[in-house]
């Protein structure tokens, strides 16, 4: 029978990219386990990750039910084995997370340039419309399905032989840019939600250059 007291979780942090959402916390448990609950502001508390020794809990299944809601989570600490609990009057110890609104806060994942096609002095660049874990009618929605016109992509492109970058923007997943005939260009894309105050931009996509496999060239 142990004497180590149960301690409350701390540093509760949301980690979310393209709506894949995990709550993380500390400390690594010693003689205790955790159960997580999640709720909307007006909803009920739903338990997840029961009696776990992990310090993270995947809450994606819950938040994708309505990504525009604001969620709150709490992490309960329970004594493992015959360890005494510190909860007052039998009340379990728990700690609340910060509020989290997936639509406004999920990080935008790194985009991928799916293809590019040159026709004369025009290049059509297509950014992959990434699938999210948000469902509607039993099918997974893409990032564009979820964000609509709130989501734009910025394309940075430049002549392979120089460093001066130009930019183009689109509220679809396609760019049509002007290039000089016979000159090779490189580009990368970035997802942006201009209306946001936090997590406005994704990381840059990998750089793609003309003359590589993803491209098609027609005179």
């Amino acid at each position: 029978s142990g004497t180590t007291n149960t301690v409350a979780a701390y540093n509760l942090t949301w980690k979310s990219t393209n709506f894949k959402t995990i709550l993380e916390w500390e400390p690594k448990p010693v003689n205790q386990v955790y159960t997580v609950q999640i709720s909307t502001k007006s909803g009920d508390w739903k338990s997840k990750c029961f009696y776990t020794t992990d310090t993270e809990c995947d809450l994606t299944d819950e938040i994708v039910k309505d990504v525009k809601q604001t969620y709150l989570a709490r992490v309960f600490s329970y004594p493992a084995g015959n360890v005494e609990s510190t909860g007052s009057a039998g009340e379990p110890l728990y700690e609340n997370s910060p509020e989290f609104t997936p639509y406004l806060e999920t990080n935008l994942g790194q985009p991928t340039i799916q293809s590019f096609e040159q026709v004369g002095t025009k290049v059509n660049v297509t950014v992959e419309d990434e699938r999210t874990l948000v469902r509607r009618n039993n099918t997974f929605l893409s990032l564009r399905d979820v964000f609509g016109k709130d989501l734009i992509y910025t394309l940075y492109y430049w002549k392979s032989s120089s460093s001066g970058k130009k930019t183009a923007k689109t509220n679809t997943n396609e760019f049509l840019i002007d290039v000089e005939k016979g000159v090779s260009y490189c580009f990368f894309a970035q997802a942006v939600i201009p209306s946001r105050t936090v997590n406005r931009k994704s990381t840059d996509s990998p750089v793609e250059c003309m003359g590589q496999e993803k491209g098609e060239f027609r005179e």
Partner: antibody, heavy 121, light 107 residues
């Protein structure tokens, strides 16, 4: 098929201890929590606690804290429940029950046949 | 601990009748509720999990629903083999707790 087979009936004197075993077969032992639930004669069901066979971590209902010990032997896919300082009110059928899949983690989808423990002087 | 108040404690109905059992939680437990059937001298059997999901292999005459903290278990057409005691169980809060049971008999 998936089953849980428990040890036989026990008669104990007050103050003694009893250890009940539950052998699992037909599934991956480490992947499912195991619970212990008891039922006094003519009464309802009472949850005692849970053991994670993967790491051996246990959580007990406060009522049994300090008196119950749940252990497991991964080599034989067996879990054990030991209850000490027995009193007459511990007379009951003791069941082991498997926690369900991740979909229904705390639903008891497979039950042992039960072990009758009688505490009498 | 969360109290699960089950009613009625017993009932008698005819074969083919619709039978309804309710379970009320002392506080909000979301849909974290299961229903079990226990026949005399046997271990309980899971029928419904997460308030309304039918366990594999369980006849479709059994169903469950939720309204706030009130949960309902229904047998749409009582069969002789349904004679048993039925229990609800919540798992949203530690410790897990059961209702007191409802004994179903045939008239």
């Amino acid at each position: 098929q998936v089953q849980l087979v428990q040890s036989g009936a026990e008669v104990k004197k007050p103050g003694a201890s009893v250890k009940v075993s539950c052998k699992a077969s037909g599934y991956t032992f480490a992947n499912y929590y195991m619970h212990w639930v008891r039922q006094a004669p003519g009464q309802g069901l009472e949850w005692m606690g849970i053991i994670n066979p993967s790491g051996g971590i246990t959580v007990y209902a406060q009522k049994f804290q300090g008196r119950v010990t749940m252990t497991r032997d991964t080599s034989t896919s067996t879990v054990y429940m030991e209850l000490s300082s027995l009193r007459s009110e511990d007379t009951a059928v003791y069941y082991c029950a498997r926690g369900g899949s991740k979909v229904a983690a705390l639903a008891f989808d497979i039950w042992g046949q039960g072990t009758m423990v009688t505490v009498s002087s | 601990d969360i109290q699960m108040t089950q009613s009625p404690s017993s009932l008698s109905a005819s074969v083919g009748d619709r039978v309804t059992i309710t379970c009320q939680a002392s506080q909000d437990i979301s849909n974290s509720l299961n229903w079990y059937q226990q026949k005399p001298g046997k271990a309980p059997k899971l029928l419904i999990y997460d308030a309304s999901n039918l366990e594999t292999g369980v006849p479709s005459r059994f169903s469950g629903s939720r309204s706030g903290t009130d949960f309902t278990f229904t047998i749409s057409s009582l069969q002789p083999e349904d004679i048993a005691t039925y229990y609800c169980q919540q798992y949203n809060f530690h410790p897990l707790t059961f209702g007191g049971g409802t004994k179903v008999e045939i008239k």
